[in-house]
Every structure is written in structure tokens, then in C-alpha cells.
């Protein structure tokens, strides 16, 4: 290709409009001023350059903020966001939700890039942790955000966020990101009544010890079985065959179902058989009958 | 999957016409955006026409007057009707289509393979 380099007479560029797009790349780069498309960028949004075009104007405003560009340009970058690196964004101070926000709906539909997954963490590293708004914004554009974290970012969530979260936020999650968000939401939902914190507290649970679930046996929840499911097996073992038939009330039938599936299996295991008798489902794999049961973990401790 | 095919392209006398033909499947033109571009040997890609709700019609300077883009939206194709061509108009052309989102603004684009058109006695 020809390298050209002045721009030709008559087309150095006043503004920034559709007449740009029937310019070649070299005159884009040759007539446009990087300080007028810095300016103008919101123009940039309304105009179908293509791809190649958007490479020339990105180099311009790269040239023009070697050290990353201002929030004032960011917000408006529209489409071009979709042209720049994480390199590129690790260069960036994002402080406002309407900047953050307005990168996110350019890549709406699409799974999470490496380009968004950076401006998220530089913009959450700036703001210090994970406010109720960011995570509102965040988790309305991609579900499976808050899954995304590992248990030491989680932990920067303060319990009052946990209000913006889904069931479907944590579908992902696996149980060390559980462990660390449950205890922030048995604390943001402190103060409300039995039936109303079951209902917020129940897609945590699978971060919750054996004492709350013991408690919780004592109120009638009524716990379906998808939910006991993802209990944590460790927290599910020392529960007595009463307390999972309260814990489960109606539902208890569908352990039957999920018999050969943990954490239900390893329950079976630690139960006494004439105690699983009493649910009349037909459970197996019980402690026999005169069978002495030693907790040799206790037994450790002791010692 | 989105695909944008031309045709219509070939060996034409100066002073001749042609007319070239964009089909796209996948995407529909009306309410997007499509334009047709060429590449001359040694230059760089430009646009020579193009047609959108959003836009209207534009055409590149050197052919204003002897170009004319259209749209059929029954058959989904964009053409292009090329009068009184000369030597510089001998290119690789190029049909192009870009999505026009609900929320404003563009998003993906896909070209066609190119189809030459030469100018010559």
C-alpha cells in the first residue's frame, strides 16, 4: 500500500461526521486532529467506520494520551472500546458507574472479554471494594460475575451489597466462594423474620455451617432438595435424621431420589438404619442395629 | 452464520456500465447498514457508496453522478449500477454490511470475498 502522508487540499477535517468514512486510512490519519476526535469522540458512536478505520483513530488518541486516556474520553468511546487491549485499559482510572456502564453496553450480548474483565477490576480496585451499586450494575450485565472472583475479592464485598444479588449471581459459585459470601449475607439479612430470611438467605446455604442449619430446622423452611443438594457435605454430616426431616418438611421424599448422591450418600452412611427406617422412604446403607458408632476424630482430640 | 457474497464484476470498455450484486444471508440490510468499497492495486481500501435508514445514501466524490447504490429488500441484496467508467476505476470491489444495534451505534461487520472489475479497451 501507498504510504501517504499530508493530508490533501480541502480535507483536513473541521469535524467529526459521516463524511469520514469515505476517508482511505492514510487520510484519516493524516487529516484528522487526535484533539478534535478526543473532543468529539461521542460523534464517533453515530458513524459506521469500519474496523480498519477504527484502528487509525484509536492509534490517533493513543498518541495523543501515551499515558492512558481521561475519563472524559473513555466514556464516550463507544464501539472503539471494542478495539482496545487490556494493556490498553490497565492504563485507565475509571471512577464513575456512568462511564463503567456505558463501556458495558457496547459489549452487551457477548461474553465477558478480557477487555471488560480488566476495566472491571481497574474501576473495582479504584473504588477500594464492591459497593451495592457496582455490583447492581455489574451482575445486571453478566450473571455470573460475582462467581467469576476468587474467595479473597469476595471477601472485599460488604454484607450491604449482598442485597443486589440474584439466586441466578450464584449459580456458578462454587462452595470457597460460598463460604466467604454466606456469612456476609446471614448478616445483611439479620433483621428479618424466619419465612422472608429463608427466602434471601437460601441460594447462601451453601456456605452455611452445621449450627445454622440446625437452627434452621427448628422454623418450618421447608427446604427443597435442590437446595440441599448444595449444602456442604461437612456441614450436612452431623445433622440427625429428625433434623434433615424438619429441615426438608414436604420435600424429604425427594431424598430417595438423590440416595446415591453426596451429600445425601455420606448422610446415609453416618445415620443409624433404624433411624432412617422412620422416614419410611426405603433409605439404605445405614449403621446396622447394635452397632457401636466410634468418633475417632473425637477420640483425637482427646488425646 | 453471516455471509455476504458478490457478484456482477468482470472486463468492461471504458465508458461502459456494469452493475454489481450483494446478497447477504444471516443479516438482513434493511435497517442495517450496507456500502459497497474498492482497493485499487498499491492503495488502500475505500468507500464508495453506501445506504442506511440511519445514514441515507452517500457516494465518494469521484463517482457522484455515475454511481448509484440501491437496495432490494425482497431479495436482500444491495447493488451497485456503475456508468461511465474509466481506467481509474478498476478495483477489487467490496461489499460490506454492519449491524445497527437497538441501543445505537454499530456492531459486527462482515466483507465479501471482493469482485474485480477492470477498465480497459
Known amino acids: 500500500e501507498v504510504e501517504k502522508t499530508a493530508c490533501p487540499s480541502g480535507k483536513k477535517a473541521r469535524e467529526i461526521d459521516e463524511s469520514l468514512i469515505f476517508y482511505k486510512k492514510w487520510e484519516l490519519e493524516a487529516c484528522v486532529d487526535a484533539a478534535l476526535l478526543a473532543t468529539q469522540m461521542d460523534r464517533v458512536n453515530a458513524i459506521p467506520f469500519t474496523y480498519e478505520q477504527l484502528d487509525v483513530l484509536k492509534h490517533k488518541l493513543d498518541e495523543l494520551y501515551p499515558q492512558g486516556y481521561p475519563e472524559s474520553v473513555i466514556q464516550h468511546l463507544g464501539y472503539l472500546f471494542l478495539k482496545m487491549s487490556p494493556e490498553d485499559i490497565r492504563k485507565w482510572n475509571v471512577t464513575s458507574l456512568e462511564t463503567l456502564k456505558a463501556l458495558l453496553e457496547v459489549n452487551k450480548g457477548h461474553e465477558m472479554s478480557p477487555q471488560v474483565a480488566t476495566l472491571i477490576d481497574r474501576f473495582v480496585k479504584g473504588r477500594g471494594q464492591l459497593d451495592k451499586d457496582t455490583l447492581d450494575t455489574l451482575t445486571a450485565f453478566y450473571p455470573g460475575y460475582l462467581c467469576s472472583l476468587s474467595p479473597e475479592e469476595l471477601s472485599s464485598v460488604p454484607p450491604s451489597s449482598i442485597w443486589a444479588v440474584r439466586p441466578q449471581d450464584l449459580d456458578t459459585c462454587d462452595p470457597r466462594q460460598l463460604d466467604v459470601l454466606y456469612p456476609k449475607a446471614r448478616l445483611a439479612f439479620q433483621n428479618m423474620n424466619g419465612s422472608e430470611y429463608f427466602v434471601k438467605i437460601q441460594s447462601f446455604l451453601g456456605g452455611a455451617p452445621t449450627e445454622d442449619l440446625k437452627a434452621l430446622s427448628q422454623q418450618n423452611v421447608s427446604m427443597d432438595l435442590a437446595t440441599f443438594m448444595k449444602l456442604r457435605t461437612d456441614a450436612v454430616l452431623p445433622l440427625t435424621v429428625a433434623e434433615v426431616q424438619k429441615l426438608l418438611g414436604p420435600h424429604v421424599e425427594g431424598l430417595k431420589a438423590e440416595e446415591r448422591h453426596r451429600p445425601v450418600r455420606d448422610w446415609i452412611l453416618r445415620q443409624r438404619q433404624d433411624d432412617l427406617d422412620t422416614l419410611g422412604l426405603g433409605l439404605q446403607g445405614g449403621i446396622p442395629n447394635g452397632y457401636l458408632v466410634l468418633d475417632l476424630s473425637m477420640q483425637e482430640a482427646l488425646s | 452464520e453471516v455471509q455476504v457474497v458478490e457478484s456482477g464484476g468482470g472486463l468492461v470498455q471504458p465508458g461502459g456500465s456494469l452493475r454489481l450484486s450483494c446478497a447477504a444471508s444471516?443479516?438482513?440490510?434493511?435497517?442495517?447498514?450496507g456500502g459497497w468499497f474498492r482497493q485499487a492495486p498499491g492503495e488502500q481500501r475505500e468507500l464508495v457508496a453506501s445506504?442506511?435508514?440511519?445514514?441515507?445514501?452517500k457516494y465518494a466524490d469521484p463517482v457522484k453522478g455515475r454511481f448509484t447504490i440501491s437496495t432490494d429488500t425482497a431479495k436482500n441484496t444491495v447493488d451497485l449500477q456503475m456508468n461511465s467508467l474509466g481506467p481509474e476505476d478498476t478495483a477489487v470491489y467490496y461489499c460490506?454490511?454492519?449491524?445497527?444495534?437497538?441501543?445505537?451505534?454499530?456492531?459486527?461487520?462482515?466483507w465479501g470475498q471482493g469482485t474485480q472489475v477492470t477498465v480497459s479497451s
Open positions: 444471516g443479516i438482513t440490510f434493511s435497517g442495517n447498514y
Open positions: 460490506y454490511a454492519r449491524v445497527r444495534l437497538s441501543r445505537g451505534g454499530w456492531g459486527s461487520e462482515y
Open positions: 445506504m442506511s435508514s440511519a445514514l441515507g445514501t
